[in-house]
């Protein structure tokens, strides 16, 4: 893996220490020839969780085009999911207009949908 990236199975991962909105985080990953992390299994979930710690971190899952989609085209419907109880809820109560369209790790690792403009940390993934 490149310097400052961590290897696991067939992928390399980079863990940010600053925050960006989801679209900017994905753009950052793309500039590194990567994408926001696509969580494909419970093992991968635990690996990322271990490195991220109890911090909100963007993952490569969004419903900004309507259906939930992983950024690399991995099928959402048949794939691994780790939503927190009651999530996703497309909450409108933030009062900023619209619901919530981007997924992130929460403090306990469970996923939540949130406003894509929140400046959360993020995780990039690329193939080895």
């Amino acid at each position: 893996c490149p310097v400052n990236w961590v290897g696991y199975e067939g992928s390399c991962y980079w863990f940010s220490r600053s925050g960006k909105p989801w679209p900017e985080a994905e753009k950052y990953c793309q500039l590194e020839n990567a994408h926001l992390v696509v969580v494909g299994s419970w093992e991968e979930q635990k690996f990322i969780q271990h490195h991220v710690g109890p911090v909100n971190s963007w993952i490569g899952l969004t419903d900004q085009s309507g259906p939930w989609k992983w950024v690399d085209g991995t099928d959402y419907e048949s794939g691994f999911k780790n939503w927190r109880p009651e999530q996703p809820d497309d909450w409108y109560g933030h009062g900023l207009g619209g619901g919530e369209d981007c997924a992130h790790f929460t403090e306990d690792g469970g996923w939540n949908d949130d406003i894509c403009q929140r400046p959360y940390r993020w995780v990039c993934e690329t193939q080895r």
Epitope: D63, Q64, S65, G66, P67, W68, Y76, E77, K81, W83, P85, E86, Q87, P88, D89, D90, W91, Y92, G93, G95, G97, G98, G99, D101
Partner: antibody, heavy 117, light 107 residues
Framework: EVQLVESGGGLVKPGGSLRLSCAAS????????MNWVRQAPGKGLEWVSS????????YYADSVKGRFTISRDNAKNSLYLQMNSLRAEDTAVYFC??????????WGQGTLVTVSS | DIQMTQSPSSLSASVGDRVTITCRAS??????LNWYQQKPGKAPKLLIY???SLQSGVPSRFSGSGSGTDFTLTISSLQPEDFATYYC?????????FGPGTKVDIK
């Protein structure tokens, strides 16, 4: 294939009740907000109600508040609309539709509710 | 509640014409504006979401623009299958509201 199929429409007298159902297939039902939209004969579209994926958040149009109840059973991939105290002005085709702030897609074919004595 | 208005309420056009429909919100809805097409006896079909994003499978002759309170749906070259009624809808906040519709028929 993502699909929604409504059922339960029919003729009912004013003051009566009816329960509409919407069977969903082809997607992870619990991950999506669902909606009911109606269309009176020859009229435009009117949003009726929405429910979030886990039923945490529920919203109604003022015209049906207190009379209609939206619910869902994620284990059965089903959405419901319990309609009580029906009025003539509730006569419409009722559509269920998936989605939220990014628009409603797909829609069911609709089920006709007629309120008449 | 946010009120939605559309103009014109109906229009007559020919195949190949450029058609523009406008939608106005009573207050800012940023970009949370969706467009639907409906044909008689059928369910509505999503064409454009969040003001300008083309729904998957929708022909590129359909486009949307605008933000805040004023929005436009444009059909660059009207095709026979485009004769229908078009509705705008705000999804900025509840209660969601639809415009009254614009019927596009054959001149």
């Amino acid at each position: 294939e993502v699909q929604l199929v409504e059922s339960g429409g029919g003729l009912v007298k004013p003051g009566g009740s009816l329960r509409l159902s919407c069977a969903a297939s082809g997607f992870t039902f619990s991950s999506y907000s669902m909606n009911w939209v109606r269309q009176a004969p020859g009229k435009g579209l009117e949003w009726v109600s929405s429910i979030s994926g886990s039923s945490s958040y529920i919203y109604y149009a003022d015209s049906v508040k207190g009379r209609f109840t939206i619910s869902r059973d994620n284990a059965k991939n089903s959405l419901y609309l319990q309609m009580n105290s029906l009025r003539a002005e509730d006569t419409a085709v009722y559509f269920c539709a998936r989605g939220g702030s990014r628009g409603f897609d797909p829609w069911g074919q609709g089920t006709l509710v007629t309120v008449s004595s | 509640d946010i009120q939605m208005t559309q103009s014109p309420s109906s229009l007559s056009a020919s195949v190949g014409d450029r058609v523009t429909i406008t939608c106005r919100a009573s207050q800012s809805i940023t970009s949370y504006l969706n467009w639907y097409q409906q044909k008689p006896g059928k369910a509505p079909k999503l064409l454009i979401y969040t003001a300008s994003s083309l729904q998957s499978g929708v022909p590129s002759r359909f486009s949307g623009s605008g933000s805040g309170t004023d929005f436009t749906l444009t059909i660059s070259s009207l095709q026979p299958e485009d004769f229908a009624t078009y509705y705008c809808q705000q999804s900025h906040s509840f209660p969601f509201t639809f415009g009254p519709g614009t019927k596009v028929d054959i001149k």
